[in-house]
């Protein structure tokens, strides 16, 4: 079943997907599509990489991480309710039926009208190149410390940790960072 991620209308959504290149520079094509992963390719492609660059994208979709080291996590800018649904991250490993496929469910919630939250510590300044996902409300930020290369088996662990709301609350309350790996 799909792993679920949440974002509010108007926020940026973050859908994690990682692989470890077999050797430095041995990148493989990756596609992101709207809808569950089909047998081949991605349906309704929103972004695609080749062995070197992002070579196709549609507006509002980009890779903010170091995709040349295997961080092919998708950022969707300024989401609307229409962005809800299943997204497919497909690591297109050469060979017959070798692809790794991940279905991620994005749930978009209407924006809450809340008083201006107290200013949070600027994690990005403290930890450059960190990955941040917006959680259940404007004051909640789940933050992952500088991620090393993550192999394919670790992604489900990462996904489970990310979707655990108690973890999100702990992160918010303690200002902690998680180091995976």
């Amino acid at each position: 079943s799909e792993v679920e991620y949440r974002a509010e209308v108007g926020q940026n959504a973050y859908l994690p997907c990682f692989y470890t290149p077999a050797a430095p520079g041995n990148l493989v094509p990756v596609c992101w599509g709207k809808g569950a992963c089909p047998v081949f390719e991605c349906g309704n492609v929103v972004l695609r990489t080749d062995e070197r660059d992002v070579n196709y994208w549609t507006s509002r979709y980009w890779l903010n991480g170091d995709f040349r080291k295997g961080d092919v996590s998708l950022t969707i800018e300024n989401v609307t309710l229409a962005d809800s649904g299943i997204y497919c991250c497909r690591i297109q490993i050469p060979g017959i039926m070798n692809d790794e496929k991940f279905n991620l469910k994005l749930v978009i919630k209407p924006a809450k009208v809340t008083p201006a939250p107290t200013r949070q510590r600027d994690f990005t300044a403290a930890f450059p190149r960190m990955l941040t996902t917006r959680g259940h409300g404007p004051a909640e930020t789940q933050t992952l410390g500088s991620l090393p290369d993550i192999n394919l088996t670790q992604i489900s662990t990462l996904a489970n940790e990310l979707r655990d709301s108690r973890l999100a609350n702990d992160l918010r309350d303690s200002g902690a960072t998680i180091r995976i790996g």
Epitope: G25, R52, D53, S59, W62, F67, R68
Partner: antibody
Framework: QVQLVQSGAEVKKPGASVKVSCKAS????????MDWVRQAPGQGLEWLGY????????SYNQKFKGRVTMTTDKSTSTAYMELRSLRSDDTAVYYC?????????????WGQGTTVTVSS | DIVMTQSQKFMSTSVGDRVSITCKAS??????VAWYQQKPGQSPKLLIY???NRYTGVPDRFTGSGSGTDFTLTISNMQSEDLADYFC?????????FGGGTKLEIK
Amino acid sequence: QVQLVQSGAEVKKPGASVKVSCKASGYTFTDYYMDWVRQAPGQGLEWLGYIYPNKGGTSYNQKFKGRVTMTTDKSTSTAYMELRSLRSDDTAVYYCARSGYGNYYTMDYWGQGTTVTVSS
Amino acid sequence: DIVMTQSQKFMSTSVGDRVSITCKASQSVGNNVAWYQQKPGQSPKLLIYYASNRYTGVPDRFTGSGSGTDFTLTISNMQSEDLADYFCQQHYSSPSTFGGGTKLEIK
């Protein structure tokens, strides 16, 4: 040391083709991409595309697709860029440049440039 | 295609100045921006890649910063040999694109 040595200046008529060569030395030719970039007189830089000698894979700027072909000769560590159906606005200095994973596919060594003049 | 905009075509500087050259991408390119220096009659030279990584042999007075859409090349202690054109490049997507360049001149 790494060197990229390009062929000499060319003067061509509109509609003709030009083929520029770039001989590489001082590194393993097949381990790096070869990008091609041009610069019109007094202007900025424009990327034409790249070739990966190891696999022969190419990626071209859509603006030039159908007019540009990039090839390599691994036996002589030479890359070639052919541009067809030349127009006056193709007048520029054409550069080959090496790029590799270590520098995130930015261009760390450049040829000296080949001036291509298109004039009737 | 991603458009890279260097809004200042020319900048007047003096030796010893701190100079900041800016570049704006039309969409987020993460950290995938490089900076090149080009002197008259010469080929471009790589200074900075992946936004802030100084290329081998580049003096440490050259510093790159920024991410997303806004990037800056800073020369902390301008030298006469730094008079040149400076180009930013996004190396995120194909086709790779360059800014129009910023020429440093002496006041």
